[in-house]
């Protein structure tokens, strides 16, 4: 069974940095395993090699471990709209992202999906796209921002939150609406 | 016009299990990836989980994987929601959605079906 992860976090400094401790034998602190390696078996003794077995295809380590296991390889998630940036190697995980002119929202800390960036029809460019983040768009007068999108204020309907901003052509709006009712 | 429909939530005992089904109709059902999110009072909007066209490949939140199971019946324009190991913090009202194309905001979602884990 492997140890919670605090306890395997006290053992290990118990040994200098680049060591683990043998988790039979807390007397002896083996030499971990570089990245794109594995641990295959402890170390037999003091000054012994640790045995270390490269990772095979469609894994990783990315770091000095003592991972009984490679991690697998994450792919990019083609329903989300991503695209391979560098592909997986053993020391190093599949890099995702979005292609030109898109930018990555984060639905969740391991899950994003790619928009296109917002062309501010009708606005002004207040802030470029960015990797992580859409256009900022400021309209112009007789438009009013929804879903980062500058729509014609005569869309604006006493509901929405435009109505401020599209103060005198609400009024016209109402006028309709109000003169359409029996 | 779009229409999903969750059915399956109610009171369960923490460890049950429950099934949540959402009925799509108004699109084609067998294109489109399909999401299941959740919000728990007073707290925003989850993801829990969503699955391609093709079944293949679902994604779970690391809060769910190894105990929900998400699947879909294209034949019948039905996705599901298996839920087991229920914990209190599942407790929330369950949304299935179309996965979003335009930008980060749900165009269609249902109503939801609640998911109490209590004992």
């Known amino acids: 069974l492997v140890p919670p992860l605090r306890d395997r976090e006290k053992r290990d400094s118990v040994c200098p940095q680049g060591k683990y401790i043998h988790p039979q034998n807390n007397s002896v602190c083996c030499t971990k395993c570089h990245k794109g390696t594995y641990l295959y078996n402890d170390c037999p003794g003091p000054g012994q090699d640790t045995d270390c077995r490269e990772c095979e295809s469609g894994s990783f380590t990315a770091s000095e471990n003592h991972l009984r296991h490679c991690l697998s390889c994450s792919k990019c998630r083609k329903e989300m709209g991503q695209v391979e940036i560098s592909s997986c190697t053993v020391d190093r995980d599949t890099v995702c992202g979005c292609r030109k002119n898109q930018y990555r929202y984060y639905w969740s800390e391991n899950l994003f999906q790619c928009f296109n960036c917002s062309l501010c029809l009708n606005g002004t460019v207040h802030l470029s796209c960015q990797e992580k983040q859409n256009t900022v768009c400021t309209c112009h007068a007789g438009f009013f921002l929804r879903e980062n999108e500058c729509v014609s204020c005569s869309n604006c309907k006493k509901t929405l939150e435009c109505t401020k901003l599209c103060l005198p052509q609400t009024e016209n709006v109402k006028g309709t609406e109000d003169s359409g009712t029996t | 016009e779009v229409q999903l429909l969750e059915s399956g939530g109610g009171l369960v005992q923490p460890g049950g299990s429950l099934r949540l089904s959402c009925a799509a109709s108004?699109?084609?059902?067998?294109?489109?990836?399909m999401v299941w999110v959740r919000q728990a009072p007073g707290k925003g909007l989850e993801w829990v989980s969503h699955?391609?066209?093709?079944?293949?490949?679902?994604f779970y939140a690391d809060s769910v994987k190894g105990r929900f199971t998400i699947s879909r019946d294209n034949s019948k324009n039905t996705l599901y929601l298996q839920m087991n190991s229920l914990r209190a913090e599942d407790t929330a009202v369950y949304h299935c959605?179309?996965?979003?194309?335009?930008?980060?905001?749900?165009?269609?979602w249902g109503q939801g079906t609640l998911v109490t884990v209590s004992s």
């Open positions: 108004g699109f084609t059902f067998a294109h489109e990836t």
């Open positions: 959605a179309l996965l979003p194309k335009r930008g980060p905001w749900f165009d269609y």
């Open positions: 699955i391609p066209p093709d079944g293949q490949d679902p």
